[in-house]
């Protein structure tokens, strides 16, 4: 056995992968390598066996640079059959390589063809359907012919694929099925003698569904109390388990352990293992592990056990001693950091009274008080009382809760009008915002100007996203401000701030905003400030009731900030249905600073033009059509008649006189005055009164004497009356004439 080149793996004196020797012979194996090495033997060969001798690796080979070791096994037996391996020690440089050499030694014994014999009691072999199954009937000689049989009459023949034979391992079944469940045996006939070794395959369900320990971790006990831990393992129907415990006192068997099976579930097994220690001591504290094994399946569950000499309470604030929350929150948890054992009794006080009696919204959860649907009433001092009566231990701790409220503007919550109010032009107006919040909000007033064009209608003239300006009493933005003031008032039991803005002279339309803010949030109320020069923002007027042949003149004036689509319509009733006939549209309207005017003129009316005339306009905010109606009754025409004829009349010179010609007719008659058949025009000293119905002559002279005639005329005809006016005190010349 020469010393050639460097040995990457150790070299054995017996070449090849296997070697057959007879029982009773001596096995001699030498191992040579570049480094120190060790031997690995079959499990059936005990290192303590007197027949076994292994020399430690010593220098050998050329220049003594190699290591040699020998293994000697005197009087080898059949059960010494197995794999013998020489491997470099892991500390050497070759540890990364496969630094070992092995040889399988068959110790042939005609009387023991099988290494292990199971005759009376079959060896239990766990199997899982669909997985590899090995029936481990290893033999002492590779030449032994072995047959695999299944009770009672079946023979499982190796086919080189699903079932194969390996003299070192036994029968290998690639994927086991239910057919391999049951009693199997390996048979070998040597020198006419039949040898049988039996195996019972147990189908492993191996399905551990769940492992739990009750009570849950951590388990806390006082010195002298009893520890009871219940470990439950839930498995599939036909699954067996082995349950064991690891715990601090296991070495001294501190615990008693009982096991039982709960069969109340139709498709599961529930295995219980109950660990019990009476009179626990400090030494029992630590980790308790329940280990559950089923074939190749394994699960474990831990729980930690704490043992205290005596009870204790320690309580601290989890947050600050003064805590803040916000009204309207779904819940708020007031929590204390408590360490105590055993579990103390807990009472929460609010302002000195038991909290849970004060309101059903207070729930105790562990060392926390949960306040549901937080309101301002929940502000106050909260005290946790902790007590362990048996240990005569009591502790308390107080936390203050402040309930903040986002600002609220009372006027916003009151149902607002569907369309904004109108403020009469030039009027003094008082605008109010009533505000509540915790902390007390700061209130500012703002002005959003309306950039509107007087000459054309604009319905979107005033948008809230336009630039806004903060106001103070001296502001000259928008309308003149008389004052901005604030006062505190109690409304419905709470302190509210009333902020008032007084507008001295309503001239400019826009939006006033009151803004209230605190650290919780901001709220804003917009007051649309629409100025109107029209009473109630909508007015209809009829110049006069026309007579047949006259002109009908109607006028409709609406506030332009509130209304659009202005139209005159005539309402007619046909078959008990009111029909709307549009007779004048918006395009004929004129737009002023604050209003839109639409005039309706119907020339030369006839009786058929009588009816209900309505001005219709659409409210910009509600979309509702508003109608203002006026009844028009066209009067029937009649010829003029005088209420009283003129009569001759005497007047003193330089005096004054009035001639009265009252006429009626439809349409109203036109009155014309004549003197001596000449039409009288108004001139100094001659005054024609209203509708020409009176003629007034001041400082009468002798030239004013004569025949005066009045004529009343309309389309239907004319009527006249005459009288002689005598002027007294005239000159002789006049008398002579």
């Amino acid at each position: 056995y020469g010393s050639g080149s460097k040995l990457k793996v150790p070299e054995l004196s017996l070449k090849g992968t296997q070697h057959v020797m007879q029982a009773g012979q001596t096995l001699f194996l030498k191992c040579r390598g570049e480094a120190a090495h060790s031997w690995s033997l079959p499990t059936t060969v005990s290192q303590e066996d007197k027949r076994l001798s292994i020399t430690p690796p010593s220098a050998c080979g050329r220049d003594n640079r190699q290591f040699c070791s020998t293994l000697t096994l005197d009087t080898a037996q059949a059960n010494h059959t197995g794999l013998y391996t020489c491997r470099y020690l892991p500390t050497s440089t070759s540890k990364k390589k496969k630094a070992e050499s092995s040889i399988y030694i068959f110790v042939s014994d005609a009387g023991s063809p099988f290494i292990e014999m199971h005759t009376d009691i079959p060896k239990l072999v766990h199997m899982t359907e669909g997985r590899q199954l090995i029936i481990p009937c290893r033999v002492t000689s590779p030449n032994v012919t072995v047959t695999l049989k299944k009770f009672p009459f079946d023979t499982l023949t190796p086919d080189g694929q699903r079932i194969t034979w390996d003299s070192r391992r036994g029968f290998i079944i690639a994927n086991a099925t239910y057919k391999e469940i049951g009693l199997l045996n390996c048979e070998a006939t040597v020198n006419g003698h039949l040898y049988q070794t039996n195996y019972l395959t147990h189908r492993q369900t191996n399905t551990i569904l769940d492992v739990q320990i009750r009570p849950p971790s951590p388990v806390r006990l006082l010195h002298g109390q009893t520890l009871v831990l219940n470990c439950t393992a839930t498995t599939e129907l036909n699954t067996r388990v082995q349950m064991s415990w690891n715990y601090p006192g296991k070495a001294t068997k501190r615990a008693s352990i009982r096991q039982r099976i709960d069969r109340s579930h139709s498709h599961n097994n529930v295995f219980h293992s109950v660990l019990k220690i009476n009179n626990v001591e400090s030494r029992d504290k630590g980790l308790y592990t329940c280990r559950v094994k089923s074939g190749s399946s394994f699960q474990s569950f831990n729980t930690s056990v704490h043992v205290y000499e005596k009870g204790f309470i320690s309580v601290k604030h989890r947050k600050q001693p003064v805590q803040e929350t916000t009204a309207g929150r779904r819940s708020y948890r007031l929590s204390m950091k408590v360490k105590a054992f055993p579990s103390p009794e807990i009472v929460w006080l609010k302002d000195g009274s038991p909290a849970t009696l004060k309101s059903a919204r207070y729930l105790v959860h562990g060392y926390s008080l949960i306040i549901k649907d937080v309101t301002t009433e929940d502000a106050g001092d909260y005290t946790i009382l902790l007590g362990i009566k048996q240990s005569r231990l009591f502790k308390n701790l107080t936390a203050t809760l402040i309930v903040n409220v986002k600002p609220q503007i009372y006027e916003k919550s009151v149902s607002s009008l569907p369309s904004p109010p109108l403020y009469p032009l030039g009027s003094r107006q008082v605008l109010t915002c009533t505000v509540y919040g915790i902390p007390r909000p700061t209130i500012t007033w703002l002005w959003h100007p309306c950039h509107h064009n007087h000459s054309k209608e604009r319905y979107d003239f005033c948008t809230e996203n336009e630039e806004s300006f903060i106001l103070d009493p001296s502001s000259n933005l928008g309308n003149r401000i008389e004052s901005i003031s604030q006062r505190m008032t109690v409304i419905e039991g709470t302190n509210k701030t009333v902020s008032t803005l007084v507008v001295a002279d309503s001239q400019t339309p826009g939006i006033y905003s009151c803004r209230a803010f605190n650290k919780i949030g901001t709220v804003e109320r917009n007051i649309k400030f629409y100025v109107t020069d029209v009473p109630n923002g909508f007015h209809v007027s009829l110049e006069k009731m026309p007579a047949e042949g006259e002109d009908l003149k109607l006028s409709c004036v609406v506030n332009k900030f509130l209304y659009r689509d202005i139209t005159w319509i005539l309402l007619r009733t046909v078959n008990n249905r009111t029909m709307h006939h549009s007779i004048s549209k918006q395009k004929m309207a004129t737009t002023q600073d604050y209003s839109i005017t639409l005039n309706l003129v119907i020339k030369n009316v006839s009786l058929e033009d009588s009816g209900t005339y309505a001005c219709r306009a659409r409210n910009i905010y509600t979309g509702e059509d508003i109608l203002r109606k006026t009844e028009v009754l066209v009067r029937d025409s009649e010829a003029p008649h005088l209420l009283q004829n003129l009569s001759d009349y005497e007047v003193s010179i330089s005096g004054s006189t009035t001639l009265d010609c009252q006429a009626r007719g439809v349409p109203a008659p036109q009155i014309t005055w004549f003197k001596n058949n000449h039409k009288i025009q108004q001139e100094p000293g001659i005054i024609l009164g209203p509708g020409n119905s009176t003629l007034f002559i001041e400082r009468v002279t002798e030239e004013d004497e004569g025949v005066y005639r009045c004529r009343a005329t309309n389309q239907k005809g004319a009527v006249e009356s005459a009288a002689y006016l005598t002027v007294q005190g005239t000159s002789d010349k006049s008398n002579l004439e």
Partner: antibody, heavy 115, light 112 residues
């Protein structure tokens, strides 16, 4: 291969006791649970009870007072004893391996309860 | 007890055809570990019952894929495609979720 075979009398007098035997092969009674199921003529099957792999038993509460299931593992046999039989106990009685539900059944034994 | 109701009681079908058998339980068959233990069995003439499907939809090894199970909670269905002469018999559903284990009263399948 897995086999189950029921045996016992075909005729039983009213108020007497029914004794049936189920002999199994191809599996171990130590590994599998086994149930008895009967099918009264013209009706659906009825589960009577289960013998667990470790020898424990669970019975249908409707039959608990008059039913006993036991086994002899060395003989691979399971026994059913039902007393106080009435005519409506007539039907076919099966033993069935109880694993993935009832995966193997015996051929059944027809039992008539009549005087 | 959980009552299992099968419909129809019987049905006649042509070879190559398809059938659906319904099974309804009086309460949910979902077990505390989340499994649903509903099985289907066939009993062919003068034979003992044979397991076809377990846990609602799992076919037993060796059972043709013409058989399929579905459903959840309380409503379950067995479908058989491409009916063959060997498929005739009585089909039963059974529950193994709660004691006592119970079965439906059966659906008899006949070939036209």
């Amino acid at each position: 291969q897995v086999q189950l075979k029921e045996s016992g009398p075909g005729l039983v007098r009213p108020s007497e006791t029914l004794s049936l035997t189920c002999t199994v092969s191809g599996f171990s009674l130590s590994d599998y649970s086994l149930s008895w199921v009967r099918r009264p003529s013209g009706k659906g099957p009825e589960w009577l009870g289960r013998l667990w792999f470790d020898g424990d038993t669970t019975y249908n509460s409707a039959f608990k007072s008059r039913l006993t299931i036991s086994r002899d593992t060395s003989k691979d046999q399971v026994f059913l004893k039902m007393n106080s039989l009435q005519t409506d106990d007539t039907g076919t009685y099966y033993c069935t391996r109880d694993d993935r539900d009832f995966d193997y059944w015996g051929q059944g034994v027809m039992v008539t309860v009549s005087s | 007890d959980i009552v299992m109701t099968q419909t129809p009681v019987s049905m006649s079908v042509s070879l190559g055809g398809q059938v659906s058998i319904s099974c309804r339980s009086s309460q949910s068959l979902v077990n505390n570990n989340g499994n649903t233990y509903l099985s289907w069995y066939i009993q062919k003439p003068s034979q003992s019952p044979q397991l076809l499907i377990y846990k609602v939809s799992n076919r037993v090894s060796g059972i043709s894929d013409r058989f399929s199970g579905s459903g959840s909670g309380t409503d379950f269905t067995l479908k058989i495609n491409k009916i063959e002469p060997d498929d005739l018999g009585v089909y039963y559903c059974g529950q193994n979720t709660q004691y006592p284990l119970t079965f439906g009263s059966g659906t008899k399948l006949e070939i036209k």
